[in-house]
């Protein structure tokens, strides 16, 4: 199984929940479905408050129960690490694959922590990140902002990751704005 | 009590064709996965394939997949293998196994000219 | 394609203790508590001594005991009896095969 990894705004967007957890137990695996459970210990949420309703509390994660099937596989074994997780909801219950964004909450820029807390959903509604893999790249919309990170040093660890969000600037109008400049 | 009973299995030319089958009894079939693993003569055991419990999901070993296909039938609480383009290494005793616990007899498949 | 490494065989006398060990990796034995150990006697079905890594099935002596320690499991029998003279195969969850299964060790109870 193979993707590439989202923009992170992408990633908030387009998922039912985003959250912040811990990992705290050993995997099992589920027989009626063949998918395997993470116990996670929730600390904070940042998008999926209508799509729970009032059970706001998400104590597993599911995954398929293999890696060639895009199943997620959590190599960490600290259970005091804080995750972000992105995932979708399927009856009730949080799914992730190896495609979903999951990372350690440390290892994110507090340009993207800001982005998760409070601006990415600004960007939801009007806008897309367009991903430019191979050049020449064309927007193809004035909602679209062109994401190059791929062409240079890898994904999640470009400077458009990092730090910039695709965010409205007029109706019919998205660009890249810096999330430093928003911290404050 | 917990019973799982092969059939099928037999001589058959390469490239052939083969439909195992596994009747399942005294327990609840469609709340457990069932997978179906061989033993070639003389050697150790090799996992072939899975089904989840509601039949929804499949997983085969590289050595089998594309030419192997596993399913069930929760209403007859059998478990099905059907394997084509057979060849002599598929050659083995092959046991139906309820996820991680009770297995089968075993049935013998040859694949042979 | 063996997956998991065991010792092709051991032996020891009536009375003593054996340990059969079974090495993974940390996406299987290390990475997930089903850890399973069967007992195939020659030309019959394997029988499940051991699962979840230390647990037994009613009807499985008390001498027949699991552990495991990293990415290493362990299968320890105790008093040893000339009909545990047999072949032993560890067996993991694997999140990269789902399925994967030790090479064997044949025990042999000398004398």
């Known amino acids: 199984c193979t993707c590439v990894p989202p923009h992170p705004q992408t990633a908030f967007c387009n998922s039912d929940l985003v959250i912040r957890a811990k990992f705290v137990g050993t995997p099992e695996v589920n027989q009626t479905t063949l998918y395997q459970r993470y116990e996670i210990k929730m600390t904070k949420m940042y998008k999926g408050f209508q799509a729970l309703g009032d059970a706001a509390d998400i104590r597993f994660v599911y995954t398929p129960a293999m890696e060639s099937v895009c199943g997620y596989f959590h190599r960490s074994h600290n259970r005091s690490e804080e995750f972000l997780i992105a995932g979708k909801l399927q009856d009730g219950l949080l799914h992730i694959t190896t495609c979903s964004f999951v990372a350690p909450w440390n290892s994110l820029s507090l340009a993207q922590r800001r982005g998760f807390t409070k601006t990415y959903t600004v960007g939801c509604e009007e806008c897309t990140v367009f991903p430019c893999l191979s050049i020449p790249c064309k927007l193809q919309s004035g909602t679209h902002c062109l994401w190059t990170d791929q062409l240079l040093q890898g994904s999640e660890k470009g400077f458009q990751s990092r730090h910039l969000a695709c965010l409205p600037r007029e109706p019919g109008l998205c660009t890249w704005q810096s999330l430093r400049s928003q911290i404050a | 009590q917990v019973q799982l009973v092969e059939s099928g299995g037999g001589l058959v030319q390469p490239g052939g064709s083969l439909r195992l089958s596994c009747a399942a009894s005294?327990?609840?079939?469609?709340?457990?996965?069932m997978s179906w693993v061989r033993q070639a003569p003389g050697k150790g055991l090799e996992w072939v394939s899975v089904?989840?419990?509601?039949?929804?999901?499949?997983y085969y070993a590289d050595s089998v997949k594309g030419r192997f296909t596993i399913s069930r039938d929760n209403s007859k609480n059998t478990l099905y293998l059907q394997m084509n383009s057979l060849r002599a290494e598929d050659t083995a005793v092959y046991y139906c196994?309820?996820?991680?616990?009770?297995w089968g007899q075993g049935t013998l498949v040859t694949v042979s000219s | 394609d063996i997956a998991l490494t065991q010792p092709a065989s051991v032996s020891g006398s009536p009375g003593q203790s054996i340990t059969i060990s079974c090495t993974g990796t940390?996406?299987?034995?290390?990475?997930?508590?089903?850890v399973s150990w069967y007992q195939q006697h020659p030309g019959k079905a394997p029988k499940l001594m051991i699962y979840?890594?230390?647990n037994r099935p009613s009807g499985v002596s008390n001498r027949f005991s699991g552990s495991k320690s990293g990415n290493t499991a362990s299968l320890t029998i105790s008093g040893l009896q000339a009909e545990d003279e047999a072949d032993y195969y560890c067996?993991?969850?694997?999140?990269?095969?789902?399925?994967?299964f030790g090479g064997g060790t044949k025990l042999t109870v000398l004398g």
């Open positions: 067996q993991s969850y694997d999140f990269i095969r789902f399925m994967v």
């Open positions: 979840d890594v230390s």
């Open positions: 089904i989840s419990g509601n039949g929804s999901n499949t």
């Open positions: 196994a309820r996820f991680l616990d009770i």
């Open positions: 940390s996406s299987d034995v290390g990475g997930y508590n089903y």
């Open positions: 005294g327990f609840t079939f469609n709340s457990y996965a």
